[in-house]
Interface confidence: low
């Protein structure tokens, strides 16, 4: 009679993490009598996966009833596969011996590859805010995927970016892999509403890539532009001077009025108007009693935005044309508009 052969028909099996792997094995003969065992790996360090005769293997079930005398199907199923289960599995036939069973014939092996989904990409930006025209770096990380092949793309508002570097670790064989990418993004004044998106495509995702996002509103600082104007006289001896603070982000802003270099009033931006691009506008006014001044007045609007060095704009108020009266102290108010501008 022809000698028994152990046949493992599948050279390789690819299984998604969490699913069940079926490892097929058949024998060509019932003789010799003896148990079957499954191992991962070969040689002295091989790991026992299933022993027909003894042991407890909760994740393993047999495809057929191995206690049937004429059974020649020794296929097994391994449940809840993880990347750590990857490797080459051998179906080994033993023949009855005394005191121990003796290894008789091994199958050629089936390589189990585990497809593990990458974790949701995590995008992180710079620790400090940057202003338009500056280049900032964003990092994207995703872990735990297998096989190693993976595609990572960067987008800004749906437009693909090209300036980035990506590494997949480790370089050698591993049960699972990680990807790390750094993209450089040039900020523009319109980026308050912008998003940077890291998109990861992998065989396990069936064409539906994972995305991680970062809002540039957390990264950008748009410095304000200032304009100081003198309004028509509201009442005799009173001049209204306004300071328009335009196109700034974030909202954190403190404004100080100075009269001839002396602090007149300090206020914090409250009722701002929002532009379409996400930046803010704000206006503060100062009511100056010109009769309190003998000489021309230099009015300065000084703005400290988001903890940055102050910027200022000055306006020379001519008082010579106004009657000189003994007057009251300088009065000041501020106003905000509820209109929503979208530039």
């Amino acid at each position: 009679e022809e000698e028994l052969q152990v046949i493992q028909p599948d050279k390789s099996v690819l299984v998604a993490a969490g699913e069940t792997a079926t490892l097929r094995c058949t024998a060509t003969s019932l003789i010799p009598v003896g148990p079957i065992q499954w191992f991962r790996g070969a040689g002295p360090g091989r790991e026992l996966i299933y022993n027909q005769k003894e042991g407890h293997f909760p994740r393993v079930t047999t495809v057929s009833d191995l206690t049937k005398r004429n059974n020649m199907d020794f296929s097994i199923r391994i449940g809840n596969i993880t990347p750590a289960d990857a490797g080459t599995y051998y179906c080994v036939k033993f023949r009855k011996g005394s005191p121990d069973d003796v290894e008789f014939k091994s199958g050629a092996g089936t390589e189990l590859s585990v497809r593990a989904k990458p974790s949701a990409p995590v995008v992180s930006g710079p620790a400090a805010r940057a202003t338009p025209q500056h280049t900032v770096s964003f990092t994207c990380e995703s872990h735990g995927f297998s096989p190693r092949d993976i595609t990572l793309k960067w987008f800004k508002n749906g437009n693909e970016l090209s300036d980035f570097q990506t590494n997949v670790d480790p370089v050698g064989e591993s049960v699972s892999y990680s990807i790390h990418s750094t993209a450089k993004v040039v900020l523009t004044r319109e980026d308050v509403h912008s998003q940077v998106i890291c998109e990861v495509a992998h065989v396990t995702l069936q064409g539906d890539p994972l995305r991680g996002t970062a809002n540039l509103s957390e990264t950008i600082r748009v410095p304000p532009t200032l304009e100081v104007t003198q309004q028509p006289v509201r009442a005799e001896n009173q001049v209204n001077v306004t300071c328009q603070v335009r196109k700034f982000y974030p909202q954190r802003l403190q404004l100080t009025w100075l009269e001839n270099g002396n602090v007149s009033r300090t206020e914090t931006a409250s009722t701002v108007t929002e532009n379409k691009d996400g930046t803010y506008n704000w206006m503060s006014w100062l009511l100056v009693n010109v009769s309190a001044h003998r000489d021309d007045v230099k009015l300065t609007c000084q703005v400290e935005h988001d903890g940055q060095p102050a910027v200022s704009k000055s306006h020379d108020l001519k008082v010579s044309a106004h009657p000189k009266e003994q007057g009251s102290n300088t009065a000041a108010e501020n106003t905000g508009s509820n209109e929503r501008n979208i530039y």
Epitope: G158, R340, I342, Y343
Partner: antibody, heavy 122, light 107 residues
Framework: QVQLVESGGGVVQPGRSLRLSCAAS????????MHWVRQAPGKGLEWVAV????????YYADSVKGRFTISRDNSKNTLYLQMNSLRAEDTAVYYC???????????????WGQGTTVTVSS | DIQMTQSPSSLSASVGDRVTITCQAS??????LNWYQQKPGKAPKLLIY???NLETGVPSRFSGSGSGTDFTFTISSLQPEDIATYYC?????????FGGGTKVEIK
Amino acid sequence: QVQLVESGGGVVQPGRSLRLSCAASGFTFSSYGMHWVRQAPGKGLEWVAVISYDGSNKYYADSVKGRFTISRDNSKNTLYLQMNSLRAEDTAVYYCAKEPRSYWHGYGMDVWGQGTTVTVSS
Amino acid sequence: DIQMTQSPSSLSASVGDRVTITCQASQDISNYLNWYQQKPGKAPKLLIYDASNLETGVPSRFSGSGSGTDFTFTISSLQPEDIATYYCQQLSNYPITFGGGTKVEIK
């Protein structure tokens, strides 16, 4: 092809509620801002509301603010308009419409549904 | 809110005529203006975006111009299928507002 189909219109009494739906197909719904626009019988177009691609930003016309709520379910490719405290002046054909650019809103409406009629009458 | 004043409210012209519609914004809206065509019983259709850009698939006889507060929409040679109501729309501020519409008819 890109398609928007509104539903949920009908006759309703003043003060009651109605929910309109807009089923989207033929494009990546989750990437686009969406609008509701209405048109009273024999009148012009009136913008009602917009919602950003991810639902995080919503804007409304003053005439519906506090009464109407725009929402979306990206898993179902569906846009909604919940209309409460309905008034006779809300009687109109309601259209849903798609923004032309992904991830943004405020560029207009390049694809419109066929409209669903809402009649508020006692 | 920004008011959009469209004129004329209706017009009648012959096939082949040049038709011009104007739209005036109550404040500066830069070029954030679209033009739509609505045929009776149908949904509106985007023709021009950002004041002067022709939407894909729209015939070249339609054009738009303007910036700031004054805008013009032109049909260079009126065709029978152009019978419709035309609307301008500003997108500079929320709430978005439309012009009152211009009904175009054939003489």
